[in-house]
């Protein structure tokens, strides 16, 4: 058993049929010694008396809020949550496996630049009685500070018969050094509580691996005289790290016809312009990627050929 926060405790249980469970001793937080009784949740049934209560925790029916009283007055509470371990593996019932970039990906994180600011998000099908708490650090043995805000519900998605809830959190490394080579990864830890079930999820990454630039801005077309060609130009996104001579991007320019089946023409360039053939009813799209490290491409910026 360990303390998650004040008066909230997590009991770790091996979860299999007829498992013996864990013996837990609860102590009433009071100087009183006599006349103390214990109840669970809203029940008035007295479970025991005395300053301590010993219980065998085997299932969710044994978890909940234990309260010690004296003469009708509440003295203290202890909330017991369960953390299930099945076949040696901690349960992951609360969050949905996003399966990208690989199986068992519960947390996904992205950074728009090297400032040390990043966003993580996760999915669940659970709509009520759900709380999240997020902590982060750089490194784990001698951790350096990363400050995370509160996790908030950011979107709801209906996919077929399923409803998914997307939560996100923003974090900022306290003393980020954008140009420094990272040697220790960022660690993100999410505590999830659904009713009386506790689970924890972790992700470990270098900022360089989660970089996803914003799309290029000011995408413009300039027709070239007596030609079907156009000059496409764009600029670095405002959110990208500076100076751009050091934090450089590379770009992919794509000409896409109206039909998805039409062949796509693609050009790769380090410049902020390119010359392409603009077909009727086609659109031109440009996306960006860190020039020196193959992290994610940005979303596409697009403009119609017409």
């Amino acid at each position: 058993i360990w303390e998650l926060k004040k008066d909230v405790y997590v009991v770790e249980l091996d979860w299999y049929p007829d498992a013996p469970g864990e013996m837990v001793v609860l102590t009433c937080d009071t100087p009183e010694e006599d006349g103390i009784t214990w109840t669970l949740d809203q029940s008035s049934e007295v479970l025991g008396s005395g300053k301590t209560l010993t219980i065998q925790v085997k299932e969710f029916g044994d978890a909940g809020q234990y309260t010690c009283h004296k003469g009708g007055e509440v003295l203290s509470h202890s909330l017991l949550l369960l953390h299930k371990k099945e076949d040696g593996i901690w349960s992951t019932d609360i969050l949905k496996d996003q399966k990208e970039p690989k199986n068992k990906t519960f947390l996904r994180c992205e950074a728009k630049n090297y400032s040390g600011r990043f966003t993580c998000w996760w999915l669940t099908t659970i709509s009520t009685d759900l709380t999240f708490s997020v902590k982060s650090s750089r490194g784990s043995s001698d951790p350096q500070g990363v400050t995370c805000g509160a996790a908030t519900l950011s979107a709801e998605r209906v996919r077929g018969d399923n409803k998914e809830y997307e939560y996100s959190v923003e974090c900022q490394e306290d003393s980020a050094c954008p140009a420094a080579e990272e040697s220790l990864p960022i660690e993100v830890m999410v505590d999830a509580v659904h009713k009386l079930k506790y689970e924890n999820y972790t992700s470990s990454f270098f900022i360089r691996d989660i970089i996803k630039p914003d799309p290029p801005k000011n995408l413009q077309l300039k027709p070239l005289k007596n030609s079907r060609q156009v000059e496409v130009s764009w600029e670095y996104p405002d959110t990208w790290s500076t100076p751009h001579s050091y934090f450089s991007l590379t770009f992919c320019v794509q000409v896409q016809g109206k039909s998805k089946r039409e062949k796509k023409d693609r050009v790769f360039t380090d410049k902020t312009s390119a010359t392409v053939i603009c077909r009727k009813n086609a659109s031109i799209s440009v996306r960006a990627q860190d020039r020196y490290y193959s992290s994610s491409w940005s979303e596409w910026a697009s403009v119609p050929c017409s």
Partner: nanobody, 123 residues
């Protein structure tokens, strides 16, 4: 050309809720980023929220964070803006828009716009 059609606006008392809908005419549109903006008389069009249909990277204006929430329905090719704890200052015409290029927060970055739906919050 993709068309966006908003609905669901109306008159509501402060503290109340509304759900705006935006239906996209083309199925392929659900692969894109979209946004909601609002405009009240004599003011510039203001960013409300921006999101990607495929997930992640959802952004909200500070003034609506925690009160407004994006919801999407793939089968109906529709995006919803659920507005809770409405305030008189939320009164505006609300537009849904399809992203084109540039900053997610700028109206200039969106190339396809709906006709707008009026939301009035009375005190």
């Amino acid at each position: 050309e993709v068309q966006l059609v908003e609905s669901g606006g109306g008159l509501v008392q402060a503290g109340g809720s509304l759900r705006l809908s935006c239906e996209a005419s083309e199925r392929t549109f659900s692969t894109y980023r979209m946004g909601w903006f609002r405009q009240s008389p004599g003011r510039e069009r203001e960013f409300v929220t921006s999101f990607n249909w495929s997930g992640g990277s959802t952004y909200y204006a500070d003034s609506v964070k925690g009160r407004f929430i994006i919801a999407t329905d793939d089968a109906k090719n529709t995006v919803y803006l659920r507005m809770n704890s409405l305030k008189p200052e939320d009164t505006a015409v609300y537009y849904c828009a399809g992203y084109s290029s540039g900053s997610y927060y700028s109206p200039r970055s969106y190339g396809v716009w709906g006709q707008g739906t009026q939301v009035t919050v009375s005190s």
